[in-house]
Interface confidence: low
């Protein structure tokens, strides 16, 4: 049914879906704090621009009786139930923030006539790619795939002189929401990653992974997995690893590698960690102080969603344009706005661009060091450490196929 939007006459409302099922197990109170912090910033920016308007958020909670698993598995209907609740209350804002689960976002996008923008902190899966009124503020699986293909093909760096075309992917089904969809994208037979690789096998059992580490007949030296160092240790322990094995550990939303006092454990020496470039130090200042590094990124995405709305609202109001139009709904893409910890760039499809960082463990210092960075906006790799102190022979990454290149 047609729901009137509280989005005119100097009063602009944001509908925030507070779903029990979420991409990260973050207390809803922390997300409220993030939204409120964002509102404060937006109000100040609008006031600085001489726009005397009111911006508020309405938090829409699900009843929690039916959808109470807490993770994303039962989220498909929760988003639709919340939309029904909004519809019944005739209370829709100018923009919808949430949901974060791929299942619920996909279903909501499918089942509603979206004439308003939807901003998500999550929705990592490929099924949420290329949605005209959906904006995603945490790196989606497509961005990871493009990095991996770019890195696999790279062969002109002092520390990587071979193109790779093979990989194992470890995926045991217990992953967090972000990892689940990242690995799902790598597993998919029709994905860009699968299309570009000559060989790819998914390892689903711990034993399969453990056996590959020393298997002389392995088809690839490269294993991709997703999670933190503790997750890797639980799986790998102190087992011996063939010297030409390279483990790519995808751990995007974890700032801990950059903390001054962090020492890399010994089991990380064969590992390249893919993470995101850490933000501005002001992130330690306010709403995020008591959040874990991962949860900080999640709450930050909510906050940045508010700032994005404020950015677009300011532009449209300054141009005297109507907010409740398809033009507004489709405008949340191909732009850069001032986020909480610096500029945030959205690509042509409304997905956040970022700087991914590939780290290695220095055998000299036992510290994580930046090997290279990758700009998702231009799909380009920038080497940082031209003479890395690798564990691998000749301080070069081995070939991906056993028996060729430095062993």
């Amino acid at each position: 049914s047609q729901v009137s939007q509280n989005c005119h006459n100097g009063s602009y409302e944001i509908s925030v879906l507070m779903m029990g099922n979420s991409a990260f197990a973050e207390p809803l109170k922390n997300l409220e704090d993030a939204v409120n912090e964002g509102l404060e910033i937006v109000r100040g920016r609008l006031q600085n621009a001489g726009l005397n308007v009111t911006v508020n958020a309405t938090f829409m909670y699900s009843d929690g009786l039916i959808h109470n698993s807490g993770d994303c598995r039962s989220s498909t209907c929760e988003g639709l139930d919340l939309l029904r609740k909004i519809s019944n209350a005739q209370r829709m804002g100018c923009v919808l923030i949430g949901p974060s689960c791929t299942y619920s976002t996909f279903q909501m996008y499918l089942d509603t006539e979206l004439s308003y923008p939807m901003i998500s902190a999550g929705s990592f899966g490929l099924s949420c790619d290329y949605k005209e009124t959906l904006t995603r503020l945490m790196s989606p699986a497509r961005k990871l795939m493009y990095f991996l293909v770019n890195f696999w093909k790279t062969n002109d760096l002092p520390f990587k002189t071979y193109s790779w075309s093979t990989s194992y992917v470890y995926k045991n089904g217990t992953e967090t929401e972000d990892c689940f969809w990242y690995l799902n994208a790598l597993e998919a037979s029709v994905s860009y990653f699968s299309h570009e690789l000559g060989f790819k096998v998914v390892l689903r059992q711990d034993k399969e992974f453990q056996d590959i580490l020393m298997d002389h007949n392995r088809k690839s030296n490269v294993i991709i997995m997703c999670g933190g160092p503790e997750f890797l240790y639980k799986l790998k322990g102190d087992r011996a690893v063939a010297e030409d094995i390279v483990i790519i550990l995808v751990d995007l939303f974890n700032d801990q590698y950059f903390e001054d006092n962090v020492t890399a454990p010994d089991y990380m020496k064969n590992v390249l960690v893919l993470t995101l470039s850490p933000g501005n130090s002001l992130l330690n200042s306010s709403f995020s102080r008591n959040l874990s590094p991962t949860k900080r990124d999640f709450a930050l995405a909510y906050l940045n969603g508010i700032l994005l709305f404020g950015h677009m609202l300011k532009i449209f109001l300054e141009n005297g344009e109507n907010i409740t139009t398809p033009k507004f709904a489709h405008a949340f893409r191909n732009l850069t706005f001032e986020g909480y910890d610096g500029p945030v760039t959205l690509d042509d499809w409304g997905d956040v661009d970022s700087t991914m960082v590939l780290l290695y463990t220095s055998v000299d210092t036992k510290k994580y060091k930046v090997l290279l960075t990758y700009d998702t906006h231009v799909n380009k790799t920038y080497p940082v450490d031209m003479s890395p102190t690798f564990t691998w022979k000749n301080s070069k990454l081995p070939n991906d196929i056993t028996g060729r290149g430095p062993q």
Partner: antibody
Framework: QVQLVESGGGVVQPGRSLRLSCAVS????????VHWVRQAPGKGLEWLGV???????DYNAAFISRLTISKDNSKSTVYLQMNSLRAEDTAVYYC?????????????WGQGTLVTVSS | DIQMTQSPSSLSASVGDRVTITCRAS??????LNWYQQKPGKTFKLLVY???RLQSGVPSRFSGSGSGTDYTFTISSLQPEDIATYFC?????????FGQGTKVEIK
């Protein structure tokens, strides 16, 4: 007009506490964070802490054990409570409204209230 | 914590002179540098924020520049009403910190 007015200053004995008030008018109190800054005689400025619009607080680590900032939205007033005062806490205490992110400036200051710690 | 070093601590100049004050941060503050004026017996007034942005209503003779750790505040033509102490402040990270101040007098 837009203003912040501090009160509660005066002479306090060492070891005692003080509670200063900052009454805000002329703007929507609940939309802004309010900072406390002090200026000791002949010395520089020290940032003490802030209470954000949603009620969250950040303190200068040097004062965190004896400083409490609070507010009453209904009275549009922010409070600074400081315990275990010593002579070096003698200063003019200012409240200030914070500016718009990302610039983090003090957009507007009160006139200050003098606190003298002396026996 | 970030330390701010401001110089000179005082200066004396004639009306019409160009006056320059510098502020150095102990680490890169990414242009999050603000300047305030405190006239004798009065409170503080924001003049310049984010290195070079002039606060509304502030005369154009005041300006700021700089990057990284080094910043400059300039009064292009000193006026009698500019007698005051000027402070820099970093807004890069908490706790916010200030320079020690520069007292400007007329010769």
């Amino acid at each position: 007009q837009v203003q912040l007015v501090e009160s509660g200053g005066g002479v306090v004995q060492p070891g005692r506490s003080l509670r200063l008030s900052c009454a805000v008018s002329g703007f929507t109190f609940s939309n802004y964070g309010v900072h406390w800054v002090r200026q000791a005689p002949g010395k520089g400025l020290e940032w003490l802490g802030v209470i954000w619009s949603g009620g969250r607080k950040d303190y200068n680590a040097a004062f965190i054990s004896r400083l409490t900032i609070s507010k009453d939205n209904s009275k549009s007033t922010v409070y600074l409570q400081m315990n275990s005062l010593r002579a070096e806490d003698t200063a003019v205490y200012y409240c200030a409204r914070h500016g718009t992110y990302p610039y983090w400036y003090f957009a507007l200051w009160g006139q200050g209230t003098l606190v003298t710690v002396s026996s | 914590d970030i330390q701010m070093t401001q110089s000179p601590s005082s200066l004396s100049a004639s009306v019409g002179d160009r006056v320059t004050i510098t502020c150095r941060a102990s680490q890169d503050i990414s242009n999050y540098l603000n300047w305030y004026q405190q006239k004798p017996g009065k409170t503080f007034k924001l003049l310049v924020y984010y290195t070079s942005r002039l606060q509304s209503g502030v005369p154009s003779r005041f300006s700021g520049s700089g990057s990284g750790t080094d910043y400059t505040f300039t009064i292009s033509s000193l006026q009698p009403e500019d007698i005051a102490t000027y402070f820099c402040q970093q807004g890069k990270t908490l706790p916010f910190s200030f320079g020690q101040g520069t007292k400007v007098e007329i010769k």
